[in-house]
């Protein structure tokens, strides 16, 4: 069978196999956030519910302030969507107004801290101008890629405007992770 | 080998390993809606296509009334894209009027129904406020994000509106699930 | 355990178990897009980065000449994120001068590539009318979904307009598949 | 099973106006945009508009802007077209229609004749 | 507004016949055309959705094709019941327009 070896005189080195079910998995869901300290010249990171309702960490994967925190080496599928809701951004007055404009946006990116470098490194960004003409607006931004990851590492969250994240459903606003 | 144990005189509890090519899965795509009755306060469940084209199950995920029927418990990825198309919403005109409004919204729902369970779940949620100004308008809506479920639990998509969805073609609007 | 079977009085055909870590994966993520021919009445393929940065492809995925090749028959899931980034559309002009408008739009296809099928196939596509009303606007397009795959199928993203792909971060555009 | 009933055949002079109703039975009334379409004897069909029942909202064809009016009435599933300052060149037979998508018709009414005349 | 065309306007035909009947749009409408049947004082049917999809509970005989502004419905094998006049509909932009139509009847 592919992947295993009984036979100790073949050489051949074979990776090895593991069960599905004990790979390091979790989804977390949107909590509201409490003003914080953020990071000068970078956009604050989320923090997120692990253990009610939909959301679980498993075999290992750990959440902790705001991180996720990667347990094992390998390549993981991480996603995010965040839902962004707001006025009606000074876009609008400033067009109407006749000049041009540089728009409003929002934007989430998921982003990798490792203790060994000095830099945290974006993996996945969405970024999109808002210049919304109804009184309200409400959006949301999807995330979702493949990386190879080390033990050790740490996964979080940034968005551009924290008070314009939805934190009113788990469903709207969630983040997670898992081992292929 | 991980995961594995030959040797009777362990007393450890492997996971048990299992050929990926057997997980449950399941692509569906879009077929055209005919008007129908929908349940009271509730948003409307598109039906699929299950086997023509790119749309298939497989491994006992079976597709049917509008239902993915999950056939083993574990952690499945959960994935689904609904392009909306309409014409010029009513937000333009009220806002020409100028008075502020509630703009129209466009909204996605992946539920999860557990016959044990009186209400349904809802896993994910996409929602957009519209306010185009366009005479003709179309966006997709994408949702994606790794589920614990158990067997027996049913998959569902709905809709805030099932006459804008787009249907003309089966990569613009779909719906699938994987065990991880 | 199953999936395995070392008793040979047994009959039964069990597909084979192989370790997830051999799997074929690819991410690619953007570079600056050179003018090239493009095929009459079908929208430019995107051309990628696929080792330096974030940008990986392993096991026999191998990229070449704007395709991800496929090594080996299988479920794979496939993703990409094009952010476009544009000048205001004509759109509001047209608007301002109170005429109904066809709007602009953007649009991103992942594409299948059979060498003994005549025609390429659509398997993914999202696409939106843009009619922005700010001088500059931006936006993210998402896809993912799983597909039953053969040996030797190709992939591709195209793009309907590709002066307007953001080509300036790794992580704002980018496209990916992994075997399940 | 899906079905439009109209009210019946009607007989106006010019200028006058008419109200044509759409009764809506088997499906949910407010889920599925209205349409109304036109044909003139021996002619083929004009999409004059549509109303959303749920919301209220409507998009009339630009010929008919300022003339037409779409309403509805949930409490009894029904949808009505009113079309004023009637001319001889309005007469037709005057369908409702339900599509699936707002962009197609996939139940018709059986028509309403409205004859123009003085 | 886009204009629909549809060629030839009438045609005579038997039973067992190959049907071609084409339409053409003033612009691209990308897939978003639909086909009617309509008989002599009735309401259209729906027969053909996003140009070649077959609405449920209508014969295989029947089959739309194209993309952008040509577009053709083809019966293949015409019956009885199939003598009536065609008509193509843009959904794609406001106002949606239907084609003049094509009488088919019996040579």
């Known amino acids: 069978l592919k992947g295993q070896e009984f036979a100790p005189s073949h050489q051949q080195v074979y990776a090895p196999l593991r069960a599905d079910g004990d790979k390091p998995r979790a989804h977390l869901t949107v909590v509201r956030q409490t003003p914080t300290q953020h990071f000068k010249n970078q956009f604050p990171a989320l923090h997120w519910e692990h253990e009610l309702g939909l959301a679980f960490t498993k075999n290992r994967m750990n959440y902790t302030n705001k991180f996720l925190l990667i347990p094992e080496s390998g390549d993981y599928f991480i996603y995010s969507q965040v839902t962004f809701r707001g006025m009606t951004s000074e876009c609008s007055e400033i067009r109407q107004a006749g000049r041009p404009n540089k728009p409003d946006s929002i934007t989430v990116v998921i982003t990798k801290v490792t203790d060994s470098y000095p830099e945290p490194t974006q993996l996945l960004m969405g970024t999109k101008s808002v210049c919304e003409v109804g009184s309200n607006w409400f959006q949301p931004i999807y995330l979702g890629a493949m990386f190879s990851l080390q033990e050790g590492d740490k996964l979080m969250v940034n968005v551009s405007d924290i008070s314009l994240v939805d934190y009113t459903k788990e469903d709207k606003t969630f983040f997670g992770a898992f081992l292929l | 080998l991980k995961g594995q144990e030959f040797a009777p005189s362990h007393q450890q509890v492997y996971a048990p390993l299992r050929a990926d090519g057997d997980k449950p899965r399941a692509h569906l795509t879009v077929v055209r809606q005919t008007p129908t009755q929908h349940f009271k306060n509730q948003f409307p469940a598109l039906h699929w296509e299950h086997e023509l084209g790119l749309a298939f199950t497989k491994n006992r995920m079976n597709y049917t009334n509008k239902f993915l029927l999950i056939p083993e418990s574990g952690d499945y990825f959960i994935y689904s894209q609904v392009t909306f198309r309409g014409m010029t919403s009513e937000c333009s005109e009220i806002r020409q009027a100028g008075r502020p409004n509630k703009p129209d919204s466009i909204t996605v729902v992946i539920t999860k129904v557990t016959d044990s369970y009186p209400e349904p779940t809802q896993l994910l949620m996409g929602t957009k406020s519209v306010c185009e100004v366009g005479s003709n308008w179309f966006q997709p809506i994408y949702l994606g994000a790794m589920f614990s479920l158990q067997e027996g639990d049913k998959l569902m998509v709905n809709v805030s509106d099932i006459s804008l969805v787009d249907y003309t073609k089966e990569d613009k609007t779909f719906f699938g699930a994987f065990l991880l | 355990l199953k999936g395995q079977e070392f008793a040979p009085s047994h009959q039964q055909v069990y597909a084979p178990l192989r370790a997830d870590g051999d799997k074929p994966r690819a991410h690619l993520t953007v570079v600056r897009q050179t003018p090239t021919q493009h095929f009459k009445n079908q929208f430019p393929a995107l051309h990628w980065e696929h080792e330096l940065g974030l940008a990986f492809t392993k096991n026999r995925m191998n990229y070449t000449n704007k395709f991800l090749l496929i090594p080996e028959s299988g479920d794979y899931f496939i993703y990409s994120q094009v952010t476009f980034r544009g000048m205001t559309s004509e759109c509001s002009e047209i608007r301002q001068a109170g005429r109904p408008n066809k709007p602009d739009s953007i649009t991103v296809v992942i594409t299948k590539v059979t060498d003994s099928y005549p025609e390429p196939t659509q398997l993914l596509m999202g696409t939106k009318s843009v009619c922005e009303v700010g001088s500059n606007w931006f936006q993210p397009i998402y896809l993912g979904a799983m597909f039953s795959l053969q040996e030797g199928d190709k992939l591709m993203v195209n793009v309907s307009d590709i002066s307007l792909v953001d080509y300036t971060k790794e992580d704002k555009t980018f496209f990916g598949a992994f075997l399940l | 099973e899906v079905q439009l009933v109209q009210s019946g055949a009607e007989v106006k002079k010019p200028g006058a106006s008419v109200k044509v109703s759409c009764k809506a039975s088997?499906?949910?009334?407010?889920?599925?945009?209205m349409h109304w379409v036109r044909q003139a004897p021996g002619q083929g069909l004009e999409w004059m508009g549509w109303i959303n029942p749920n919301s209220g909202g409507t998009n009339y064809a630009q010929k008919f802007q300022g003339r037409v009016t779409m309403t509805r009435d949930t409490s009894i599933s029904t949808a009505y077209m009113e079309l004023s300052r009637l001319r001889s060149d309005d007469t037709a037979v005057y369908y409702c229609?339900?599509?699936?998508?707002?962009?197609?018709?996939?139940?018709w009414g059986q028509g309403t004749m409205v004859t123009v005349s003085s | 507004d886009i204009q629909m065309t549809q060629s030839p306007s009438s045609l005579s035909a038997s039973v067992g016949d190959r049907v071609t009947i084409t339409c053409r749009a003033s612009q691209s409408i990308s897939s978003y055309l639909n086909w009617y049947q309509q008989k002599p004082g009735k309401a259209p049917k729906f027969l053909i959705y996003g140009a070649s999809r077959l609405q449920s509970g209508v014969p295989s005989r029947f089959s739309g094709s194209g993309s952008g502004t040509d577009f053709t419905l083809t019966i293949s094998s015409l019956q009885p019941e199939d003598f009536a006049t065609y008509y193509c509909q843009q959904g794609y932009s406001n106002p949606f327009t239907f084609g003049p139509g094509t009488k088919v009847d019996i040579k």
């Open positions: 229609a339900v599509g699936g998508s707002y962009d197609a018709f996939d139940i």
């Open positions: 088997g499906y949910t009334f407010t889920g599925y945009y």
